[in-house]
């Protein structure tokens, strides 16, 4: 009996036309939502004038439906048993699942001012930037709508910066009508233990953002894993959102709509400093902000963001060192709300429920030549927003799963 089941599973999880896996892989049957909480700055003037702690108040959720578009340019390669594809991006605002509208206003760090002052360190260029910042009536902080902040707005300061510069700024700009990839993943035809594992991303096996093993593209995209998952496994996956591969470890058994699943979580060790976790040495890319690589819980992804000083963390700086959150007031990290988990059905390796949580932060530094940054006495890693992307298998699909997979085994 068991061998027959194994054989059936192996057949059905291959990523090719006609299998259960392929149908759900091309277009997810699960509704995926991305909730945003924006950190509204309460004391912009005090920060700018006196280098006070930044007082933030999170406002949200603002919810969008995402990942509803089918994979594009799906191409099988029989020679190396891979399938390549693009994952199109799309987001639809869901007013009924949100606390307000896309027109709600927030006081946030001025993204362009923070980025330009970081990218251009030369004092004479900074004098020019200062002139253009003042001329455009820009400041250290700005008021923007949710729609502007997420999806883009024309920045008045950047509009004055001489060519070549993109004058549109947004945390996720451009998003709609763009696609992530090309991904090329193993289809599992020749070796089921490699199914869904990424072979190349954008035509390469490495990212070119990090040194050594940190630069590798490991595992799957976390939507599924090779079948027959063991609790002892470390599940590797790549996330383009954070420009790196990461891993999850088994935490507990969970019953999801009558289906036994394994809950895998991103451990604090994955966010530790190289002092605590030597494997992380290559994620430490500079010595000053990281206090000689002793800070932890924030990832400098500037190399992946055209030099813009973007730092990724867990929400509310969960698992981050005290020095990171010390200049920010109003954060309350807790594991239940702010960690990332994957609920994986172990026989098929399918992720039936997940919560991917991350926070987008921007570094802002004092600058003698830029008036609006002149009074700062310290560096700030400023939280802009955090997001919770979730998906759960639907009741109908769960019934089908119970009857066709788990029911057959039990």
């Amino acid at each position: 009996g068991d061998l027959l089941i194994q054989k059936t599973i192996k057949k059905q999880v291959v990523l090719e036309e006609g299998t259960i896996a392929f149908k759900n892989w091309v277009k997810t049957g699960t509704e995926v939502y991305r909730q945003f909480w924006i950190f509204d700055v309460q004391n912009p003037q005090e920060v700018m004038m006196n280098s006070s702690n930044i007082q933030v108040k999170q406002r949200g959720p603002y919810t969008y439906r995402v990942r509803f578009l089918a994979k594009e340019n799906v191409t099988q390669d029989a020679e190396d048993n891979t399938v390549s594809f693009l994952q199109p991006n799309g987001a639809i605002f869901e007013p009924s699942l949100s606390v307000g509208t896309e027109a709600d206003n927030f006081t946030v760090l001025n993204l362009a001012v923070a980025a330009a002052s970081h990218i251009y360190q030369n004092q004479f260029v900074q004098m020019i930037l200062n002139s253009l910042i003042n001329k455009s009536k820009s400041s250290m902080f700005q008021v923007r709508t949710l729609r502007e902040l997420l999806w883009g707005y024309r920045d008045p300061f950047l509009s004055l910066v001489p060519y070549p510069v993109t004058t549109t700024v947004g945390l996720f700009y451009p998003y709609n009508n763009t696609a992530d990839g090309v991904y090329k993943v193993f289809n599992g035809k020749d070796n089921i233990s490699k199914v869904a594992i990424i072979d190349t991303y954008k035509g390469k096996r490495n990212l070119s953002y990090w040194e050594s093993h940190c630069d590798m593209i490991n595992g799957t995209d976390a939507a599924s894993f090779p079948p027959f998952v063991e609790k002892s496994q470390v599940l590797q996956f790549f996330s383009s959102d954070i420009c790196r591969s990461i891993y999850a470890v088994f935490e507990s058994d969970v019953n999801l709509k009558g289906i036994p699943v394994y809950r895998f979580v991103l451990p604090s060790k994955a966010f530790a400093s190289p002092v605590e976790n030597p494997d992380n040495y290559c994620f430490c890319t500079e010595k000053i902000i990281s206090k000689n690589c002793t800070s932890y819980g924030v990832l400098d992804i500037s190399k992946c963001k055209e030099g813009r000083p973007v730092y990724i963390s867990l929400p509310h700086f969960l698992y981050a060192s005290p020095d990171v959150s010390e200049p920010i007031d109003g954060l309350n990290p807790n594991e239940e709300e702010h960690r990332t988990y994957l609920d994986i059905e172990p026989i098929t390796g399918f992720t039936l429920q997940f919560a991917k949580r991350l926070q987008v932060n921007l570094l802002v530094k004092p600058s003698e030549k830029i008036q609006v940054l002149k009074n700062l006495k310290r560096n700030y890693i400023v939280p802009i927003l955090w997001l919770n992307e979730t998906g759960t298998i639907g009741d109908e699909k769960a019934n089908m799963f119970r009857s066709q997979v788990t029911g057959k085994i039990n």
């Epitope: 360190q121 004479f124 020019i128 253009l132 001489p162 060519y163 070549p164």
Partner: nanobody, 118 residues
């Protein structure tokens, strides 16, 4: 290669005028912001005036506002600084500079001396 050549400096009495010119070559002049900086003896170099690439926006140091005017001629690839009501504290070496977003530091001219003295 990139060249910026300043001219027009000299000795002038307080209250007098001078017009500095900067001739550019070796780069796409029209897509650069052009600036004049100055450096007085024993002092830091400071930004005096700036004109953006489209020429639509100009900005001046507070100390020269209302007295100095920056202008550019993209066809001739020149940028000028008209200096009126000159004061002894305007004495400095004046540098022409070009910058755009693809550069981490500006291009510089050699500088021209302006001395305001009676």
């Amino acid at each position: 290669q990139v060249q910026l050549q300043e001219s027009g400096g000299g000795l002038v009495q307080p209250g007098g005028s001078l017009r500095l010119s900067c001739a550019a070559s070796g780069f796409t002049f029209s897509s650069y912001a052009m600036s004049w900086y100055r450096q007085a003896p024993g002092k830091e170099r400071e930004l005096v005036a700036l004109i953006t690439s489209a020429g639509g926006t100009t900005d001046y140091a507070d100390s020269v506002k209302g007295r100095f005017t920056i202008s550019r001629d993209d066809a001739e690839k020149t940028v000028s600084l008209q200096m009126n009501s000159l004061k002894p504290e305007d004495t400095a070496v004046y540098y022409c500079s070009a910058w755009r977003a693809s550069l981490y530091e500006p291009y510089w001219g050699q500088g021209t001396q302006v001395t305001v003295s009676s």
